[in-house]
Interface confidence: medium
Amino acid sequence: APRGTQAEESPFVGNPGNITGARGLTGTLRCQLQVQGEPPEVHWLRDGQILELADSTQTQVPLGEDEQDDWIVVSQLRITSLQLSDTGQYQCLVFLGHQTFVSQPGYVGLEGLPYFLEEPEDRTVAANTPFNLSCQAQGPPEPVDLLWLQDAVPLATAPGHGPQRSLHVPGLNKTSSFSCEAHNAKGVTTSRTATITVLPQ
């Protein structure tokens, strides 16, 4: 057969499944193949690139008494604490003699409550002096809409309608607290509460 074709002779009998979850999830992708003779090393690909530091384990079970009989090979790739960088298309790859085979793809996706990249921080300001506060969040899923709160009171009628990444405060005459809510299709995450201390004049 021509090198690298994915025809009936593909050794893969089990392909990676799909994993979709929130950040921090732990999951396992699994490939299974049946080969004759010495079992090959199974490599894992993400988006077409070999994973050099894959947390994978390989198990080999002979189906006969002879070394040249068929073997079942199972490779498992463990994903611990799912991050955005783990998402993509996963496949197994083996070199058998002069041929290369890849499995059908499985997909790893990230989907959950918004995740804060930046949250409002405590600060001390002079009375009636303007300042800015920052808040940034991401999904997936996108879009992520922000809603600012001052002393637990929303500063807009709905998420996404008022200020987003930066809140401009024209000035305060008393110590106040600020937080932001991040809304997406999965729900709401609330940032830390920043205390803005106003120095007496």
């Epitope: 490599h43 690909l45 077409g48 793809p105």
Partner: antibody
Framework: QVQLQQPGAELVKPGASVQLSCKAS????????INWVKQRPGQGLEWMGN????????NYNEKFKSKATLTVDKSSSTAYMQLSSLTSEDSAVYFC???????????WGQGTTLTVSS | DIVMSQSPSSLAVSAGERVTMSCKSS????????????LAWYQQKPGQSPKLLIY???TRESGVPDRFTGSGSGTDFTLTISSVQAEDLAVYYC????????FGGGTKLEIK
């Protein structure tokens, strides 16, 4: 069987843009990198960049970063390369090639001859 | 970026002669995980697409005559044609795919 089909020729005017196509068939399009290679008349082969259809991840040769834009249409299993601000230096044969894991492309298109002329 | 250097740039030989051409890379092309050298040799005849001859530095592509042999590892590679035939008139390119792709400048083979 695996095939990469490219139009035979394109004629465009200087300053214009062109989109070259590479239609794949006979394999799982999303699972293999598509590379683009330039060859000027009488010259050698120059790798321009590649794209992974499954995620649209791209890599570019620094020399062609501002010249070429690679995209794919998964629904039609077609890879595209857009070339902008064309000059006579862009007149060349452009090949698409499927990259196989382990180091070699096992299939090449026949190439599109691009002529930039007023 | 990995730089590929081929030599000689051209050579003329008589039919039946043995030919060797060299390809050097600026860094090792041996992938320690897969234990393969990501080096390929191509033959390109006028007006045609490049044709794969050798991959993984020494594995002959299906259908390629056994007079073509690839050897080498790491940074130094050689393509040998044991007995040149008239139809071998072509330009020969080496290509690394260890990190993206880079082609050598080519060796033009002419028949005396």
């Amino acid at each position: 069987q695996v095939q990469l089909q490219q139009p035979g020729a394109e004629l465009v005017k200087p300053g214009a843009s062109v989109q070259l196509s590479c239609k794949a068939s006979g394999y799982t399009f999303i699972s293999f990198w598509i590379n683009w290679v330039k060859q000027r008349p009488g010259q050698g082969l120059e790798w321009m960049g590649n794209i992974f259809p499954g995620s649209s991840s791209t890599n570019y040769n620094e020399k062609f970063k501002s010249k070429a834009t690679l995209t794919v249409d998964k629904s039609s299993s077609t890879a595209y390369m857009q070339l902008s601000s064309l000059t006579s230096e862009d007149s060349a044969v452009y090949f698409c090639a499927r990259d196989y894991y382990g180091g070699s492309p096992d299939y090449w298109g026949q190439g599109t001859t691009l002529t930039v002329s007023s | 970026d990995i730089v590929m250097s081929q030599s000689p740039s051209s050579l003329a030989v008589s039919a039946g002669e043995r030919v060797t051409m060299s390809c050097k890379s600026s860094q090792s092309l041996l992938n320690t995980r897969t234990r393969k050298n990501y080096l390929a040799w191509y033959q390109q005849k006028p007006g045609q697409s490049p044709k794969l001859l050798i991959y993984w530095a020494s594995t002959r592509e299906s259908g390629v005559p056994d007079r073509f042999t690839g050897s080498g590892s790491g940074t130094d590679f050689t393509l040998t044609i044991s007995s040149v035939q008239a139809e071998d008139l072509a330009v020969y390119y080496c290509k690394q795919s260890y990190n993206l792709w880079t082609f050598g400048g080519g060796t033009k083979l002419e028949i005396k």
